[in-house]
């Protein structure tokens, strides 16, 4: 009989042979899983428990954000003796149980990943019936979602004294570097990266003073790709308005 020792970070430390038949509760999850936006990811989670040959009702749960209190993104329940865990909740229909909880496997597939899915996830199993017991991973698995840059907004806004400024906001992971090019700017003017608070994947670059009419192009680039978008500035000379 094999018992697995788990440290507080839930990494496998070592395996020892014991004569005792009693397992203890533990959960094995990797610290991090990486996947690209739009693709699928697998969040592995296996567990051991002290209730030999438990065949009663069970519930498998996955939470996001924080253990014990975070919102559930997936839940399924298996009746006594059943191998089938019937899905009761799948947030946005994108979470699917891959593992078989009866075989101590709660692994989850997440489909159509978005940058907003980049967070920590926690698996939990609950036994009911003859045995009432439950266990949840404390540290969880961090889902790291990567994405090629996408320019989400580009605009020209009025500034004081009849001037104009341009703003470009892009998202991506790693956060993209932004550059402006346009009339009298040269080929590419690097902009300071400024992730917006609470929006870690969004980066905004400002061109504070547009001095010439013409086409202004914002380029966003990271290790996964690049994206471009343009705005046009055309001022009606002799008037205070502008067309963009």
């Amino acid at each position: 009989f094999v018992r697995t020792k788990i440290d507080t970070t839930e990494n496998l430390l070592n395996t020892e042979v014991h004569s005792s038949p009693a397992q203890r509760w533990s959960m094995q999850v990797p610290p991090e899983v990486s996947a690209e936006a739009g693709d699928a990811a697998v969040l592995p989670c296996t567990f051991t428990h002290p209730h030999r040959h438990y065949d009663g009702p069970l519930t498998a749960i996955w939470r996001a954000g924080e253990p014990y209190a975070g919102p559930q993104v997936f839940r399924c329940a298996a009746a006594r003796g059943s191998e089938l865990c019937q899905t009761a909740l799948s947030l946005h229909g994108r979470f699917r149980l891959l593992g078989n909880p009866r075989r101590n496997d709660l692994s989850l597939r997440v489909e159509r990943l978005a940058l907003a899915d980049d967070r920590r996830y926690f698996c939990r199993v609950e036994f009911a019936g003859d045995v009432h017991d439950r266990y949840e991973s404390r540290h969880g698995v961090r889902l790291h979602v990567t994405a090629a840059p996408r320019i989400v907004n580009i605009s020209v806004l009025p500034s004081p004294a009849h001037a104009f400024r341009a703003l470009c906001t892009a998202e991506g992971e790693p956060p993209p570097a932004l550059a402006w090019s346009g009339p009298a700017l040269g080929n590419s003017l690097a902009a300071v990266r400024s992730p917006r608070e609470g929006h870690g994947h969004l980066v905004t670059a400002e061109l504070p003073a547009l001095t010439h009419d013409g086409r202004y192009t914002c380029t966003a680039a990271n290790s996964l790709g690049r994206s471009e978008a343009s705005v046009y500035l055309f001022r009606f000379h002799g008037a205070s308005g502008a067309s963009t």
Epitope: D39, A41, P44, Q86, S107
Partner: antibody, heavy 121, light 111 residues
Framework: EVQIVESGGGLVQPGGSLRLSCATS????????MNWVRQAPEKGLEWVAQ??????????FYAESLEGRVTISRDDSESSVYLQMSSLRAEDTAVYYC????????????WGQGTLVTVSS | DIVLTQSPDSLAVSLGERATISCRAS??????????IHWYQQKPGQQPRLLIY???NLASGIPARFSGSGSGTDFTLTISSLQAEDVATYFC????????TFAGGTKVEIK
């Protein structure tokens, strides 16, 4: 015992339409995704469409080669699934199988015996 | 789309001997240790039957002489001791990315 029985196949002219039906029994239909897979004469297998269950918002997925010409639907109260096909072409001639898959895996654990669709003038 | 290529196209094996079929994917079908490759058997005039799911898991009711292995892009179906009733065409299928696709199949016969 799981049973899956297809019907509705037959001879249809090019450009015509056909509705295939699949009746199931022996399992809790609501818990599973259902699919259609086809096999042209003496050829390989080609996945056609999938419809998920209520928990997964009855989401549907189609093979690109057929998208816009086929619609998959299901009736949970009748434990049945359907495939509406239109603008049929000679290359759509095949045996059409209704298959079951678990919500966690897009593999086909049970298959019907199939229904033959022949598109010919 | 992920393209699956099976080899050989056909295979003749003596009764009791080992039969090995290969399935190669155009890109990796493994995520975090889970391989989304499945194997089916189709006997003449019958519908396909699931043999192996997720590369190595034996489907319900399938004899233990069938086994699957592999990860990434290369997978193998093995029949450890061929029986007369194993004469069939074998297909692999991927569910890593939609559309789910099948390989062209391998026909297994008795030598």
């Amino acid at each position: 015992e799981v049973q899956i029985v297809e019907s509705g196949g037959g001879l249809v002219q090019p450009g015509g339409s056909l509705r295939l039906s699949c009746a199931t029994s022996g399992f809790n239909f609501n818990d599973y995704f259902m699919n259609w897979v086809r096999q042209a004469p003496e050829k390989g297998l080609e996945w056609v469409a999938q419809i998920r269950n209520k928990i997964y918002t009855y989401a549907t997925f189609y093979a690109e080669s057929l998208e816009g010409r086929v619609t998959i639907s299901r009736d949970d109260s009748e434990s049945s699934v359907y495939l509406q096909m239109s603008s049929l072409r000679a290359e759509d001639t095949a045996v059409y199988y209704c298959t079951r898959s678990l919500t966690g895996g897009d593999y086909f654990d049970y298959w019907g015996q199939g229904t033959l669709v022949t598109v010919s003038s | 789309d992920i393209v699956l290529t099976q080899s050989p196209d056909s295979l003749a094996v003596s009764l009791g001997e080992r039969a090995t079929i290969s399935c190669r994917a155009s890109q990796s079908v493994t995520i975090s240790g889970y391989s989304f490759i499945h194997w089916y058997q189709q006997k003449p005039g019958q519908q396909p039957r699931l043999l192996i799911y997720r590369a190595s898991n034996l489907a319900s009711g399938i004899p233990a002489r069938f086994s699957g292995s592999g990860s990434g892009t290369d997978f193998t179906l093995t029949i450890s001791s061929l029986q007369a009733e194993d004469v069939a065409t074998y297909f692999c299928q991927q569910s890593r990315k939609s559309p789910w696709t099948f390989a062209g199949g391998t026909k297994v016969e008795i030598k």
